[in-house]
Interface confidence: low
């Protein structure tokens, strides 16, 4: 499950449920 980007969502975060593979981890989105 990917979280929807918004203006407050940083490009890279340590997060849960936002990566394409990890449930939690350091996730970078381009």
């Amino acid at each position: 499950r990917r979280r929807r980007r918004d203006t407050h969502f940083p490009i890279c975060i340590f997060c849960c449920g936002c990566c394409h593979r990890s449930k939690c981890g350091m996730c970078c989105k381009t």
Partner: antibody, heavy 124, light 106 residues
């Protein structure tokens, strides 16, 4: 070719601040989706993830050590840094830096490329 | 923190043996598990990521399986160069490593 190399003080005393440097080549921390992590391994023991920094300066820390850790980077010199405050003998370990796998902009904590490690001893 | 328990801690096997290493998580980590090989004096090397994906350049005798809390690393035919310590690593939440399984030749 991706390479990483750690450097540090070798020996320091309890209560001091440990400063570590990871110098790398073959990739840039200004590239989208690239991150660098620090991991340590006490002599003869297991591995412990410490911190991760990514290309646009976001950071993740091990919760149990977060108040003692600071990760940073110097993009132009291809370096990442880790500071650990108030060190104790329990911080004696080999310290590794590593680069997680990168999936075209998605970088997670699947640590792929590792440096050879630097031994740090805390002793009075 | 999620605890990772590896068994056995020491395993002796012969060349050509099929070897199975176990890793158990204290709670559900889905498939967010890697296996690393560490030879004496060297840095860890990624063998398997996301439970069963073989990292590039790793021999096909290595395979991984599992889901949830129980995971396995299998070496289908043990080779002398496989002598090492093997660590599992979860990155589902607050990344943690297991204590390792030391694999030696009989």
């Amino acid at each position: 070719q991706v390479t990483l190399k750690e450097s540090g003080p070798g020996i320091l005393q309890p209560s001091q601040t440990l400063s570590l440097t990871c110098s790398f080549s073959g990739f840039s921390l200004s590239t989208s989706g690239i991150c660098v992590s620090w991991i340590r391994q006490p002599s003869g023991k297991g591995l412990e993830w410490l911190a991760t920094i990514c290309w646009e300066d976001s950071k993740g820390y091990n919760p149990s050590l977060k108040n003692r850790l600071t990760i940073s980077k110097d993009t132009s010199n291809n370096q990442a840094f880790l500071k650990i405050t108030s060190v104790d003998t329990a911080d004696t370990a080999i310290y590794y830096c590593a680069r997680p796998l990168n999936y075209g902009g998605y970088s997670e904590l699947e640590l792929d490329y590792w440096g050879q490690g630097v031994m740090v001893t805390v002793s009075s | 923190d999620i605890q990772m328990t590896q068994s056995p801690s020491l395993l002796s096997a012969s060349v050509g043996d099929r070897v199975t290493l176990s890793c158990k998580a204290s709670q559900n980590i889905y498939k967010y598990l890697n296996w690393y090989q560490q030879k004496l004096g060297e840095a860890p090397k990624l063998l398997i990521y996301y439970t069963n994906s073989l990292q590039t350049g790793i021999p096909s005798r290595f395979s991984g399986s599992g889901s949830g809390t129980d995971f396995t690393l299998t070496i289908s035919s043990l080779q002398p160069e496989d002598v090492a310590t093997y660590y599992c690593y979860q990155y589902n939440s607050g990344p943690t490593f297991g204590a390792g399984t030391k694999l030696e030749l009989k």
